[in-house]
């Protein structure tokens, strides 16, 4: 699983790229995105 902490501290990523990775993970894990 990709944690929010990991993603928010992944330097050089755009905000959309973080949302993109969250959403791809959400489609697999069905974790609520709110």
């Amino acid at each position: 699983a990709v944690s929010e902490h990991q993603l928010l501290h992944d330097k050089g990523k755009s905000i959309q790229d973080l949302r993109r990775r969250f959403f791809l993970h959400h489609l697999i894990a069905e974790i609520h995105t709110a």
Partner: antibody, heavy 118, light 116 residues
Amino acid sequence: QVQLVESGGGVVQPGRSLRLSCAASGFTFSSYGMSWVRQAPGKGLEWVATISSGGSYTYYPDSVKGRFTISRDNSKNTLYLQMNSLRAEDTAVYYCARQTTMTYFAYWGQGTLVTVSS
Amino acid sequence: QLVLTQSPSASASLGASVKLTCTLSSQHSTYTIEWYQQQPEKGPRYVMDLKQDGSHSTGDGIPDRFSGSSSGAERYLTISSLQSEDEADYYCGVGDTIKEQFVYVFGGGTKLTVLG
């Protein structure tokens, strides 16, 4: 290897309904989000619908929202697209696509043609 | 709104290189995009995703002749040592989630002709 085979296309009159199917094999179907993307004759690609791995979440563009419904049967390894109130502008080849952890449409089927005409 | 712009056509000679461009709407210049290839009479094929810093990861079976780069709002797909099978339509695409709604848009596509 990943295989996606669409079926159910054909000629249908405006205002009528049609259901497309996508049979998946070569991977654990229930572990991935799936999508439908269409391509009108001689035109570009248009995203149509996306569904999460277990079917709990669905997403549509405004162009089909309220008319099209994406669903899945994980016990049958099959993805569906129920298309109601069809219009001439829905005429297209419809492709199903599978996501990966890295991207939305990593694997594609060969498509099925839907023609809406009176 | 989220828009991707591509030149309708491009051409290059067999064995040469070609650079295809996909331009994001200015307010979306940091976005990660995807590139797809569609050979004549076939379904699309995922080529790569391409980030704002030029880093990219390619799809299954994509040869290393295909590479990506970025500059500002522009995203490039470079194909080197062109082969006849590279003649295809190339589409870029981009997705985003806004208020728990997903949106995905494609560019209009570039038709690549390989001159032989």
